[in-house]
Amino acid sequence: TNQCTVRYNVADCSHLKLTHIPDDLPSNITVLNLTHNQLRRLPPTNFTRYSQLAILDAGFNSISKLEPELCQILPLLKVLNLQHNELSQISDQTFVFCTNLTELDLMSNSIHKIKSNPFKNQKNLIKLDLSHNGLSSTKLGTGVQLENLQELLLAKNKILALRSEELEFLGNSSLRKLDLSSNPLKEFSPGCFQTIGKLFALLLNNAQLNPHLTEKLCWELSNTSIQNLSLANNQLLATSESTFSGLKWTNLTQLDLSYNNLHDVGNGSFSYLPSLRYLSLEYNNIQRLSPRSFYGLSNLRYLSLKRAFTKQSVSLASHPNIDDFSFQWLKYLEYLNMDDNNIPSTKSNTFTGLVSLKYLSLSKTFTSLQTLTNETFVSLAHSPLLTLNLTKNHISKIANGTFSWLGQLRILDLGLNEIEQKLSGQEWRGLRNIFEIYLSYNKYLQLSTSSFALVPSLQRLMLRRVALKNVDISPSPFRPLRNLTILDLSNNNIANINEDLLEGLENLEILDFQHNNLARLWKRANPGGPVNFLKGLSHLHILNLESNGLDEIPVGVFKNLFELKSINLGLNNLNKLEPFIFDDQTSLRSLNLQKNLITSVEKDVFGPPFQNLNSLDMRFNPFDCTCESISWFVNWINQTHTNISELSTHYLCNTPHHYYGFPLKLFDTSSCKDSAPFEL
């Protein structure tokens, strides 16, 4: 019997070292996966049983010949995948009966030449992949054919020239994508693209195109339907006004010039691309942008300059330079990415003219932006910016009014910097629409009562691992944030807080307080009694108190937190939990108490929180395997649908001695009193 797995009408026979076609699969399968086996042929008679097949994938085998009768036997076949095989020749007969094919994948075979018309009957073919085959010509037939073809993939072949007579078989085709990447192209003969019915996307990545050849290509694309042109990784070292001039009679909307070692963007290089909406200049070597570098890009919406500029080296005299007004022509630009560059800083008119800009990413962009001042972003005063990413810029100080120009800003990311200062609150002046401020992973932040007084619209505040100080001041620094839904105060070694820390934050849904030092605050012996800082958080959904050294949970701290869905109390020192502490957590879905010192799990404590749980984690606790301590728990475990991972291996008895190391779930409760039918 075969080892194939069958689900619904799909048979997966991959990776089984098969040398022949299994003959005992269900006859109604519509998909058969035979990839990664040792098949040399696909004998048509072996498929008689599987006449319902619509998809046949025989990739990654050693098939050297295909018999025409295969498609006769499989009249419903729509997708045939033969990639990574040993086909060397295909004739007029090979696919003659495959009239219903919509996809044919012949990638990575040894087809060096296409003789006559093997694809003449493929009137329904939408995608044809002949990449990685050693073809020296694009000619796949003599008359017009493949009229429904949308994707033709010819990458990684040995095509040296594009000639009109070798593409005229596509005369009635509307190609969504023609991929000629990784071919050693040297020539684009006149009219080569005109013979294609319609061509919307052309990929010529890694094709060793120099500036002259690129210019020639663009003239050949003139008056075509081209919309998307990808020229990545071509050593296009410089562009000038003439480079793309041939594209002026097109509606090109996307252009990818990434990985070109592009050094010099000449003035007016893009002046003939008024329809362009997307331009990628990622991973280049640009030395300078000037006020006319982007002239003409009047419709550009997306520009990526990620790692686009010269990386500073010892031999380099100067940093890359962005002149004032370099972006002035991009009046419709909405998204600008300048991550991972070596720009010294902003200037007073760096971003002037970007009057539609909504998303600006400046992560690891600057080398000398240690202090943000009220001049840093002045050039964005007329931009309707919604998101600003300033991560990884070695920022150490934010001056008052730094962001006062950004009245529409919703998301401000200042994480992963070196900010060390007292937050007076004036830093955020003018951020009247702010939704999220991310300040996590900075050096030192000291709070004051007014730290967030000017941003009452804030809904998310992230202050993880910032050596937070003054959290215990009164009134609380968070008091003005009535709309806050997410607050992250984790990894700050906080040991002192007041009961009113979160007072009034009635909309808070997620509180991350893990990796702090709250143990003393919840002790009965705490002077003034336990500090109930969760009081009034009636909409709290997720609470993380992991790694706080907690050894007590006072009764009442979770009272009225009806909407809690997840509590993480893992990696604490909790031992005996008081009855009733989780009484109100009847909607809990996830409870984590792993790596504590819990010995007993009793109904009076855990009945309510366990009733609707999806997931429980109590691994690595020293359970006391006696009737009074765990019989209720064991009974619950053995009837629940709750996910309890590693139950057999990490829920082990610690006491009494003779049960040490024994799996909890195997504890026999039948001898315990009250082991009547389990009560939910």
Epitope: N560, F562, F580, D583, D584, T586, D604, P608
Partner: nanobody, 125 residues
Amino acid sequence: EVQLVESGGGLVQAGGSLRLSCVASGLVSSYYGMGWFRQAPGKEREFVASVNWSGKDTYYGDSVKGRFAVSRDSGKNTGFLQMNSLKSEDTAVYYCARRRGGGTGTGNPSEYDYWGQGTQVTVSS
């Protein structure tokens, strides 16, 4: 649909006793707290007492402490309010209600999601 029905109300002399019952039906689970409130004519609704899901934890309003006892039979989804040493100021319509969680709560009516129709208690002097 969850329904709560109170019974046991009536006319009683000052110093006497009454036992109110509250039967809950349509509940998916027994892990809910149960509370008693009362409302006298022209006055605001007042918290009387509550009991947690297991019946082991109780909470009382100041005016009834030591005189009233709240309990429940979880298996039968029934709650009880034993009222002793009744006074004329105890005259009111008594309502039982189901808490959103399993605990006793703080006596705030907003913690309760389902309410009964009420039963009249009249204490004559």
